[in-house]
């Protein structure tokens, strides 16, 4: 008789990251019985919402359940039937939901009321929607990379099984970049985190880990722009905004009720001359970067140390891993690899933002025009914020990794979300029987 | 400003494969699915199939399915629709489209022309 | 497959007058608590133009005066008042489950 094989004890589970630019759906996937161990989970799928972030459907909040249905839908093909009421279902929306928040509590509510609504629909287990914090985004991305690199394993090996891992338990730091915020979290060597609202206390696997995380909201790539966008349209001499953090030749017209939209720009507000204004590219790297700068202020600091903006920042410490649009962006722009220097980085920035327009298009035919013309804004804007913002130097610059998935897993937030909301990180190392689900974080 | 340029019309032989495309410029593919349709000449619309192209996932009518293949190339941001195993009842305008929500919300539609494709022996 | 029946197969109507032209599916097309419905105008020797979405969302750029409702399996479309760039042929569309089918169209000529 043949041997049929039994079927697999697996468990699954779906987290969606509704973030300020766009959705995507992560299902995970473990085996039933290792729930306990340490870097047994992984994604099995992504599916990105086709569209805007769920922000966008303020004004028709009816159609956000035909918005989400392809990718419920995926998830539905991809776990098998057995397992869907068993199945949990999070999402966790991130800034562009903060800030629709600060403008109308009514209205944030309201969109979180039909999302939560629509995805009730579906045959999983829905466990809520809700806007989950910038601390908790800054130490869910820390969880997930140093869950996936195997930091929180008390096995030594001899091999290495994931890349970055240098074979010590010495956590990476998480370096995250969204549209509308921007985390930096990492365990400081030794130094007591001056600001409580920034220090993080977890027992995970039976070690103690003092983190200091940040989110700098309104510093994510977009909002980042449009405070740029507001800070230069006030000193122009009339409805032509020449910016240099855009290629030679391009041209684009900005309704000046779209630049103060946002709570971002509010600091910049003023009344203009005109209704529209057009932006001009000059694309310099130099001049790009001066004003960029002029979005951190690093004149005042109660602290020992600063970032910017008087928000207190331990001394760097480690390896980081840079992940989101760090990763999207310097992929893009081929600048990924860990030989690449950050002067060298600077170099390829500079030739980049020069190249006129008109051959960016042609040489990037499958690229949405609206992200194309970006990427020079938003490389120069990475370097000044890891370099001015963070106080990397061109020799701590080999430190930070740009990480898009590790071990087949996207880096990012919503695994350690996950992981978190399942129970699946023990604060005590678990014996070879796993422990009834005691403490955790 | 979003255009769908799809290839020229094609008479084929009974049997042959064809293969057409529609050059999508002023929208980035990866940022929605694309529609094939066809209508046989005065009669109405066949929904063929579609393609998600940021990861290559096609679902078909059944009946196309194994004789019809939808690929697409976001590089040059085109898709493209392969017939094989013609037959005269294949005669039709095939149109590709997009259709989906964009940046701001707005639920868009946009077309190809139409690509006649003539089975004739 | 779901089945789509439209009726009637040609309207004959006067300009200003309100157009109906109703759908029916062969089953549901309901699915978490949306009608996958959608409704084309095609104009002769011119590609199909979505105009209502989910059964009732009106498309980008259409008219109010294009409007549509229902659930389940019957579905409608109105056009109140029509105006002469009206007049052409409107199919029904189910995209609940592939194969996603159109229904067999409808003529709206003028009276």
């Known amino acids: 008789t043949q041997n049929k094989a039994l079927p697999e004890n697996v468990k699954y589970g779906i987290v969606l990251d509704a973030g300020s630019s766009h959705t995507s759906l992560y299902i995970y996937k473990w085996p039933a019985e290792k729930e306990n161990d340490t870097g047994v989970v992984h994604q099995v799928e992504e599916c990105r919402v086709k569209g805007p972030g769920i922000s966008k459907f303020v004004q028709k909040v009816n159609e956000i359940g035909i918005y989400l249905t392809d990718c419920m839908e995926r998830a539905r093909e991809v776990i098998p039937r057995s397992q869907h009421q068993e199945t949990p279902v999070y999402l966790g929306a991130t800034a562009g939901m903060r800030l629709l928040r600060m403008e109308s509590e009514e209205l944030a509510d309201r969109v979180l009321d039909v999302v939560e609504r629509s995805l009730s629909n579906y045959p999983f287990d829905f466990q809520g929607a809700r806007i989950i914090t910038g601390q908790e985004e800054g130490a869910y991305g820390w969880i997930t990379i140093n869950y996936l690199l195997g930091k929180f394993s008390q096995k030594t090996r001899w091999f290495s099984i994931v890349p970055y891992e240098t074979n010590n338990q010495e956590t990476f730091g998480a370096l995250d970049l969204g549209g509308a915020s921007t985390q930096v979290t990492f365990v400081p060597q030794n130094q007591t985190i001056e600001s409580p609202d920034n220090a993080l206390q977890f027992r995970l696997y039976g070690k103690d880990y003092n983190v200091y995380t940040h989110s700098f909201l309104c510093y994510g790539k977009d909002q980042a722009l449009w405070q740029k966008l507001a800070k230069d349209i006030q000193v122009a001499s009339n409805e032509i905004l020449r910016d240099p953090c855009f290629h030679p030749g391009y041209k684009k017209v900005v309704n000046v009720s779209d630049l103060y939209k946002t709570p971002c720009t509010k600091r910049f507000e003023m009344t203009l001359p005109f209704q529209q204004f057009e932006i001009q590219g000059i694309g310099n790297y130099q001049q790009c970067h001066q004003s960029i700068l002029e979005l951190f202020n690093t004149s005042y600091c109660p602290y020992s140390q600063c970032a910017f903006n008087g928000i207190f920042l331990p001394p760097l410490q480690g390896d980081f891993g840079a992940f989101s649009a760090f990763y999207f962006v310097m992929k893009f722009l081929n600048l990924t690899s860990e030989k690449v220097s950050q002067e060298k980085v600077t170099e390829m920035m500079k030739k980049f933002c020069a190249q006129p327009w008109e051959e960016i298009k042609t040489s990037y035919a499958g690229v949405k025009e609206k992200y194309l013309s970006e990427y020079c804004f938003s490389g120069t804007y990475i370097l000044s914020l890891l370099l001015q913002g963070y106080h990397f130097t061109a020799d701590s610059w080999e430190h930070i990794h740009f990480i898009g998935k590790i071990q087949g897993s996207d880096a990012g937030w919503t695994l350690g979300y996950m992981l978190n909301l399942t129970n699946m990180i023990p604060a005590e190392q678990p014996l070879s029987t796993p422990l009834s689900h005691s403490t955790y974080v | 400003q979003v255009q769908l340029l799809q290839s020229g019309a094609e008479v084929v032989k009974p049997g042959a494969t064809v293969k057409i495309s529609c050059k999508v410029s002023?929208?980035?593919?990866?940022?929605?699915?694309v529609h094939w349709v066809r209508q046989p000449p005065g009669q109405g619309l066949e929904w063929i199939g579609k393609?998600?192209?940021?990861?290559?996932?096609?679902k078909f009518d059944p009946k196309f399915q194994g004789r019809f293949t939808i690929t697409a190339d976001t590089s040059i941001n085109t898709a493209y629709l392969e017939l094989s195993s013609l037959t005269s009842e294949d005669t039709a305008v095939y149109y590709c489209?997009?259709?989906?929500?964009?940046?701001?919300?707005?639920?868009?539609?946009?077309w190809g022309q139409g690509t006649l494709v003539t089975v004739s022996s | 497959n779901i089945v789509l029946t439209q009726s009637p197969a040609t309207l004959s109507l006067s300009l200003g007058q309100r157009a109906t032209i109703s759908c029916r599916a062969s089953?549901?097309?309901?699915?978490?608590?949306?009608?996958?419905m959608n409704w084309f105008q095609q104009k002769p020797g011119q590609p199909p133009q979505l105009l209502i979405y989910?059964?009732?969302n009106q498309g980008s750029g259409i008219p109010a005066r294009f409007s549509g409702s229902g659930s389940g399996t019957d579905f409608t479309l109105n056009i109140n008042p029509l105006e002469s760039e009206d007049f052409a042929v409107y199919y029904c569309?189910?995209?609940?489950?592939?194969?996603?089918?159109f229904g067999p169209g409808t003529k709206l000529e003028i009276k």
């Open positions: 393609i998600d192209p940021a990861n290559v996932n096609t």
């Open positions: 569309q189910q995209s609940k489950e592939v194969p996603y089918t």
């Open positions: 089953e549901s097309v309901d699915n978490y608590g949306i009608s996958f």
């Open positions: 989910a059964a009732s």
């Open positions: 489209a997009l259709y989906g929500y964009d940046d701001d919300a707005y639920y868009f539609d946009y």
């Open positions: 002023g929208f980035s593919i990866k940022d929605t699915y």
